[in-house]
């Protein structure tokens, strides 16, 4: 492959000073050393020789020749100092050194940016022996250069525990600009300024940036990378990209969509998951969030009864998990339920309203005005009461449960009676004489048994006593009444 290589006319900043030596245009060594050339023996270096040692590390051997003349310093010859080429091209460069034959086992290693290059690199060392010296040429080739191949390459040779280091060969791989920072998608508040950043690098530098909004250039003249664009605010979604230009051409960043935050869409699919007498568990599918996270939701509950006053109960909850148990509802009632959610911009409209019903519940209050009296002639206890208010029955009454407890001389027994819903009186047989009978009554619906009334006590005398004053549910605040007949 042909190498696109050229030496800079001006010194490269990292390597000041001129870079003598021929430039490479193919894969042959930069310094070819055929035996028949006019190459001077190592002992004959002259100070004016173009290839003389220059800036690399030098080893001065302590060995002398037969004539006892000291050997000259050993150093790598100069080669091209700076190679500039395009990405994906091939390149080959080399180091050369002449080593007196008295030295054995000389090896050359290649280093890049201070690290030895080991393994799968195309490094070849060729030896050209002569009578007194051996010319060694170490070649390094890269078939398709990438940006990661940029850097400073040197050769190292160890002789006599001394290290000889070549001058660096700087490889500069040029290509289209490469983005190190591209604009990011964002969700922004309407008419509020925000920043976008774009950064690209070469080589070659400089890299210049153009900003594009909805396919129109924002800046008519480029700005040096990195560039920050302050967008003065948007009223509708826009797409931004940046163009990075250098001498090799241009690279366009990904286009990013900037969305305008808005109020969310209303939730959809509000559904009833479970109903009890006093609660309804609902779920919903959130609407589009308006490019801003949901903060919380509001459940609105209206009585569906046309005779109700139309007041709305509002329950606030977190946006997750799209589930809410509405509590403190009346039993056996119809409700309209709607859900609305909010983000930082505001509240969504309410979802379509759905109809939901609570189930029957156990009554929430006990029967009222419980009265108990002894009917001695029939040896019965008569009980009368008033049924609880309809609103608080929490369902259709199916009857009552009567608890009567008989206590005398250390004996206590409780009996339960079930009576039908018709009427508001019951008669129970006297179980024990000379005892106290404590009566409590609870209303019953299909939803369950309600609370028991406050206890009413009546004393049942031994046979033959006269009575008949009734015992009643006490007024509030009077505890544990006992009426002794």
């Amino acid at each position: 492959a042909i190498t696109e290589a050229r030496e800079e006319a001006k010194p490269y900043p990292l390597f000041p000073g001129p870079f003598p030596g021929s430039l490479q245009t193919d894969h042959t060594p930069l310094l070819s050393l055929p035996h028949a050339s006019g190459y001077q023996p190592a002992l004959m270096f002259s100070p004016t020789q173009p290839g003389r040692p220059h800036t690399g590390n030098v080893a001065i051997p302590q060995v002398t020749s037969v004539e006892s003349k000291p050997l000259p310093p050993l150093a790598f010859k100069h080669t091209v100092g700076h190679i500039i080429l395009s990405e994906h091209k091939g390149v080959k460069f080399n180091c050369s050194i002449s080593v007196p034959n008295i030295y054995q086992d000389t090896t050359i290693s290649w280093w890049k940016d201070g690290k030895e290059l080991l393994g799968a690199h195309h490094a070849i060392t060729q030896f050209y022996p002569d009578d007194e010296v051996t010319a060694i040429i170490a070649s390094f080739s890269i078939t398709s250069v990438q940006r990661s191949d940029n850097g400073s390459y040197i050769c190292k040779m160890k002789i006599n525990n001394e290290e000889i280091v070549s001058d660096p060969i700087y490889i500069e791989v040029q290509g289209l600009p490469h983005f190190t920072k591209q604009p990011e998608s964002m969700n922004v508040t309407r008419n509020t300024a925000f920043n976008l950043t774009c950064q690209a690098v070469g080589p070659p530098e400089p890299v210049n940036i153009f900003w594009v909004q909805n396919s129109s250039r924002v800046n008519e003249q480029p700005e040096k990378s990195p560039s920050v664009l302050t967008v003065p605010g948007l009223t509708e979604m826009a797409v931004f990209s940046c163009e990075a230009h250098n001498d090799k051409g241009l690279t366009v960043s990904k286009g990013v969509q900037i969305n305008i935050k808005a109020i969310p869409s209303p939730p959809t699919e509000v559904s009833i998951r479970n109903s009890t007498a006093h609660s309804i568990l609902i779920s919903w599918v959130p609407g589009f969030d308006g490019y801003s996270p949901f903060r919380n939701c509001s459940i609105q509950v209206k009585e569906a009864d046309p005779l109700s006053n139309g007041s709305v109960m509002i329950f606030n909850t977190s946006a997750l998990p799209h589930l809410y148990q509405i509590k403190q509802l009346q039993a056996l009632a119809n409700y309209s339920i709607g859900v609305s959610c909010m983000n930082e911009i505001g509240w969504s409209a309410v979802s379509p309203w759905i109809l939901a019903s609570t189930t029957e519940g156990a009554p929430s209050v006990a029967p009222l005005n419980v009265t108990v009296f002894l009917n001695e002639s029939s040896d019965n206890v008569d009980i009368r009461w008033m049924k609880p208010p309809t609103k608080q029955q929490d369902g259709e009454l199916v009857g009552y449960r009567i608890s009567h407890v008989w206590q005398s001389a250390g004996i206590s027994k409780e009996l339960l009676e079930e009576v039908g819903q018709n009427g508001s009186r019951a008669r129970i047989s006297v179980q024990v004489h000379n005892a106290t009978c404590t009566v409590r009554i609870a209303a019953v619906t299909r939803g369950g048994v309600g609370p028991f009334s406050d206890p009413v006590k009546i004393f049942i005398p031994a046979h033959g006593w006269v009575d008949y004053a009734p015992s009643s549910t006490p007024a509030p605040g009077n505890a544990d009444p006992v009426l002794i007949i």
Epitope: Q213, N214, E220, Q221, E223, L229, P232
Partner: antibody
């Protein structure tokens, strides 16, 4: 601070040429494009076009192609507008205005009145 | 090219009155800029990119709009606001200006 200072008024005969200058100071001249805007007596503003101060490339609005030439001398941070073959209807105040992002003209010259009369 | 039509062309207003100048574009634009010009002066940058007041512009001025309809509003007119106001669109080349709206103080 940013300043755009334009050359003084010109009285020209029809068919002649005129060159209006706009000297910039207070910023790096080659970082911002320079626009030219015309305002005929008692009329509104008309965008004539702009010149890229980095490359020297001019862009002309359709109505200003032909006799109008934008040029630069970056060594003295100056933009020029040259009008050739002047006509009476070229009588106007010509403004230079610095390009900003979104074609926002944050800085204007004081204007140069060019009068074309025989 | 995008044609910008301002209305009204001329308005005579009493101080403290609210003033609205509209600028309608012949097709949708991204931003509208506004400039104020007084007689024998060069235009002054007034409102940038639809709604951003330039430095030194009193807060009684505001700008709004999107798409094809944009407005400049003066909440409570003062004598120093007498001037001609021009809109200018960004988004489509060539750049174009509105014909101007002249405000006069009664």
């Amino acid at each position: 601070q940013v300043q755009l200072v334009q050359s003084g008024s010109e009285l020209k005969k029809p068919g002649a040429s005129v060159k209006v200058s706009c000297k910039a100071s207070g910023y790096t001249f080659t970082n911002y494009g320079m626009n030219w805007v015309r305002q005929a007596p008692g009329q509104g503003l008309e965008w004539m076009g702009w010149i890229n101060t980095y490359t020297g490339e001019p862009t002309y609005a359709d109505d200003f192609k032909g006799r109008f030439v934008f040029s630069l001398d970056t060594s003295v941070s100056t933009a020029y507008l040259q009008i050739s073959s002047l006509k009476a209807e070229d009588t106007a105040v010509y403004y230079c205005a610095r390009y900003g992002h979104y074609a926002w003209f944050a800085y204007w010259g004081q204007g140069t009145l060019v009068t074309v009369s025989s | 090219e995008i044609v910008l039509t301002q209305s009204p062309d001329f308005q005579s207003v009493t101080p403290k009155e609210k003033v609205t100048i509209t600028c309608r574009a012949s097709s949708s634009v991204s931003y509208m800029h506004w400039y104020q010009q007084k007689p024998d002066q060069s235009p002054k940058p007034w409102i940038k990119a639809t709604s951003n007041l330039a430095s030194g512009v009193p807060s009684r001025f505001s700008g709004s709009g999107s798409g094809t309809d944009f407005t400049l509003t003066i909440n409570s007119l003062e004598a120093e606001d007498a001037a001609t106001y021009y809109c200018q669109q960004w988004g489509t080349k060539p750049l174009t200006f509105g014909q101007g709206t002249k405000l006069e103080i009664k």
